[in-house]
Amino acid sequence: EINGSANYEMFIFHNGGVQILCKYPDIVQQFKMQLLKGGQILCDLTKTKGSGNTVSIKSLKFCHSQLSNNSVSFFLYNLDHSHANYYFCNLSIFDPPPFKVTLTGGYLHIYESQLCCQLK
């Protein structure tokens, strides 16, 4: 297992929510990406391929997510101070083999300006 801090901007704020960007190498064809908050699994997305190169996308812990050819974005809404924590992208690579797990993460700071419904 490879651990490290994300060397890219992992958190993108908009409209009182946050997009958490989990990158993976574009050579990766089949994988599972989990978003962890501390040690808790918040979201996951698994991409696998069929014999005719058809693609299956599955989520056991569903969050609003977006898949590209080198990243999975997970979206969290209605931010409040309780969202402040360490978040990790836990990537399990199935294809190309051999099986490999990488963990990258960062701390999500919550500032008043990023909250969705500030009290006046």
């Epitope: 696998t48 069929g50 005719g52």
Partner: antibody, heavy 121, light 106 residues
Framework: EVQLVESGGGLVKPGGSLRLSCAAS????????MHWVRQAPGKGLEWVGV??????????YYSDLVKGRFTISRDDSKNTLYLQMNSLKTEDTAVYYC????????????WGQGTLVTVSS | DIQMTQSPSSLSASVGDRVTITCQAS??????LSWYQQKPGKAPKLLIY???LLAEGVPSRFSGSGSGTDFTFTISSLQPEDIATYYC????????FGPGTKVDIK
């Protein structure tokens, strides 16, 4: 212990039909892509076709040599794979193997012992 | 359809010899190539997948290399139990086997 046991082979006349079965045990059958591979006497291996898992809507794909004549199906509740062979030709004479493959999260590949199909008048 | 060719079609070598078999794909298959061993009257056995990864329980004298369209399978020191026919197989797009290479002892 992983086992794949083919059955249903035998002698059939050209133009006839035969249905092969493959009973699986010792692994999670429903997670595996299931293939049929054949080998004519004294010849090499030839891929016949595959049926994918439920995640891929049990999609089937066939080699050009059998397309339109052979049909692969599976019953995950019975851990059984089938090959329906119609309009058989003498060149379909072979040992037919069922094979199970998976790539996620690890690559595994299991084979049965084969069943002989002879197409002859 | 992807076609696979293999050479030589047969070879004889002495125990302890290094044996090399080549396999060529008709189009780029990245590293999606496996190698099988088949002994007479038996089902094929997976030796190597994804070009160079050894299947479980396979001795380290077997190895593979290559990428794209050209691949090589090597037995570093031939043993009597290695007498068999060896097949390459692409799994980039469905499956296609090479015609096989029969290996025997001089």
């Amino acid at each position: 212990e992983v086992q794949l046991v083919e059955s249903g082979g035998g002698l059939v006349k050209p133009g006839g039909s035969l249905r092969l079965s493959c009973a699986a045990s010792g692994f999670t059958f429903s997670d595996y892509f299931m293939h049929w591979v054949r080998q004519a006497p004294g010849k090499g291996l030839e891929w016949v076709g595959v049926i994918d898992t439920k995640s891929f809507n049990y999609a089937t794909y066939y080699s050009d040599l059998v397309k339109g004549r052979f049909t692969i199906s599976r019953d995950d509740s019975k851990n059984t794979l089938y090959l329906q062979m119609n309009s058989l030709k003498t060149e379909d004479t072979a040992v037919y193997y069922c094979t199970a493959t998976i790539a996620v999260p690890y690559y595994f590949d299991y084979w049965g012992q084969g069943t002989l199909v002879t197409v002859s008048s | 359809d992807i076609q696979m060719t293999q050479s030589p079609s047969s070879l004889s070598a002495s125990v302890g010899d290094r044996v090399t078999i080549t396999c060529q794909a008709s189009q780029d298959i990245s590293n999606y190539l496996s190698w099988y061993q088949q002994k007479p009257g038996k089902a094929p056995k997976l030796l190597i997948y994804y070009t160079n990864l050894l299947a479980e329980g396979v001795p380290s004298r077997f190895s593979g290399s290559g990428s794209g369209t050209d691949f090589t399978f090597t037995i570093s020191s031939l043993q009597p139990e290695d007498i068999a026919t060896y097949y390459c197989q692409q799994y980039y797009n469905y499956r296609t086997f090479g015609p096989g290479t029969k290996v025997d002892i001089k």
